[in-house]
């Protein structure tokens, strides 16, 4: 089975690397535009230059291409807590990240939100906070992990997962209650 190629891939594969097939004349291979530029006009003939123009402010191309327009620079999303790590240039998109002591949580492939790293209060750090992962905490005795926070076993309801971790405490509470009855 031959893998299905899109029209653009089909056209490009006929020409050597760094060149593309002229859209109106498939016997001509034009040189692709360098990163930071876009295709203004196809080359008029074999061995002749492709007319490439530099991307305007607010746009970029990050690799060699034959795009008719540069790509718009991304904006860091303030509402998601993002900050600009490096600004957009003609050949590189904006790089967004998080502040110190924060991590990225990806809601989807290209959308992340910044959250504060857990401090593991009433516990110890099992794994340090990473760029894309929160701190992993281990809780002290008498505490259980809920949404990556160490919560007192006094907040453990019998139906919750914490019952195994808090079993001694629950038994004690039950015992105290029982001893108070007549």
């Amino acid at each position: 089975l031959v893998p299905h190629l899109g029209d653009r891939e089909k056209r490009d594969s006929v020409c050597p690397q760094g060149k593309y097939i002229h859209p109106q004349n498939n016997s001509i291979c034009c040189t692709k535009c360098h990163k930071g530029t876009y295709l203004y006009n196809d080359c008029p003939g074999p061995g002749q230059d492709t007319d490439c123009r530099e991307c305007e402010s607010g746009s970029f191309t990050a690799s060699e291409n034959h795009l008719r327009h540069c790509l718009s620079c991304s904006k860091c999303r303030k509402e998601m807590g993002q900050v600009e790590i490096s600004s957009c240039t003609v050949d590189r998109d904006t790089v967004c990240g998080c502040r110190k002591n924060q991590y990225r949580h990806y809601w989807s492939e290209n959308l992340f939100q910044c959250f504060n790293c857990s401090l593991c209060l009433n516990g110890t750090v099992h794994l340090s906070c990473q760029e894309k992962q929160n701190t992993v905490c281990t809780c002290h005795a008498g505490f259980f992990l809920r949404e990556n926070e160490c919560v007192s076993c006094s907040n453990c309801k019998k139906s919750l997962e914490c019952t195994k971790l808090c079993l001694p405490q629950i038994e004690n509470v039950k015992g105290t209650e029982d001893s108070g009855t007549t």
Epitope: K78, W107, Q113, F115
Partner: nanobody, 119 residues
């Protein structure tokens, strides 16, 4: 008590339109960025769109870009999702939620409204 109540779902043919609303109460609506997420049958939650506090800046998932428009009316404490050129793959329960602050979980979201796209 925070309450989010979605409405506007229903059965629509492919190519059709719907406008979802989310009535908010129990918090200062104008202070919170808001989110639409959806859950297709047998699938996980998918982020659809979100909008900043003042309604100036919006984000759209690639799957809905150019077809859906998120908006808000802070004077009416209401969030909207205008859905055009609907496709079968848009069939899902749509939820509105407050953008999480403390961690990657939705503390406040509605009961959802079902959108079914079918001929």
């Amino acid at each position: 008590e925070v309450q989010l109540l979605e409405s506007g779902g229903g059965l629509v043919q492919p190519g059709g339109s719907l406008r979802l609303s989310c009535a908010a109460s129990g918090f200062t609506f104008a202070h919170e960025p808001m989110v639409w997420v959806r859950q297709a049958p047998g699938k996980g939650l998918e982020w659809v769109s979100h909008i900043d506090r003042v309604g100036q800046d919006a984000y759209y998932a690639d799957s809905v870009k150019g077809r859906f428009t998120i908006s808000r009316d802070n004077s009416k404490n209401t969030l909207y999702l205008q859905m055009n050129s609907l496709r079968a793959e848009d069939t899902a329960v749509y939820y509105c939620a407050i953008l999480p602050k403390r961690g990657p979980r939705f503390d406040y979201w509605g009961q959802g409204t079902l959108v079914t796209v079918s001929s």
